[in-house]
Interface confidence: medium
Amino acid sequence: PEPPTACREKQYLINSQCCSLCQPGQKLVSDCTEFTETECLPCGESEFLDTWNRETHCHQHKYCDPNLGLRVQQKGTSETDTICTCEEGWHCTSEACESCVLHRSCSPGFGVKQIATGVSDTICEPCPVGFFSNVSSAFEKCHPWTSCETKDLVVQQAGTNKTDVVCGPQDRLRA
């Protein structure tokens, strides 16, 4: 028979042959042959693989570093990674929760919509047209652009969400 060019789900092609993938929680020890099945071994303590795979090494469980304010929310298994969260009153800096902040700062271009409380983190909002924030802050709102007209000046450089407008003197040559 013709050697296969594609394999079924949960199989992989190797040496013109379809071999079974290892199930989640197990790693590949040796590929199948014409006479033997794929050989898999369970992941060790503190290791995991979360998909049907042909990996020869399991992944290490994530470490929830208490020095960064992290603690284990859900212990990892042979099939799942550990999920970290922050100590009570702290907030993750990202979805992956790799470190914690007491309350998040809003980046330049964003202003504070709501200051953090004991239970909720800072809520940031993008600065709309006409407003800017040039600092990283957990407290400052977006500031309105300077109004050059009220100072009898003209806009020399347009503002952005991160910078104020630059005002300059009127062109005296105009009638």
Partner: nanobody
């Protein structure tokens, strides 16, 4: 390397005053909002106060509003917290913090004990 060194804590009677200082080094001080945070015995961290990089804008937790004043001297790279009308519930280790971002940007703290 970012370093923050708090000082000025001590034992004070209820109604008394203290001024805490925080000497900062290893970063451009005036670029950063700075904060005071405290941890009471057996409790979690509580944010106390913050000040903008230029020193013009200040923010306070409701529990200290009207009693505490935060300030900074950018020429000396130093942050201050003037604490008046102290109460027993202000007893805590006080830390200054750079933007509250990561634990490694914290000083060791200074202990304030309010007791008669």
């Amino acid at each position: 390397e970012v370093q923050l060194l708090e000082s000025g804590g001590g034992l004070v009677q209820p109604g008394g005053s203290l001024r805490l200082s925080c000497a900062a080094s290893g970063f451009t001080f005036e670029w950063y909002e700075m904060q005071w945070v405290r941890r009471a015995p057996g409790k979690g961290l509580e944010w106390v106060s913050a000040i903008s990089g230029d020193g013009y804008r200040t923010y306070y937790a409701d529990s200290v509003k009207g009693r505490f004043t935060i300030s900074r001297d950018n020429s000396k790279n130093t942050l201050y917290l003037q604490m008046n009308s102290l109460r027993a519930e202000d007893t805590a280790v006080y830390y200054c913090a750079k933007e509250l971002e990561y634990f490694d940007y914290w000083g060791r703290g200074t202990l304030v004990t309010v007791s008669s």
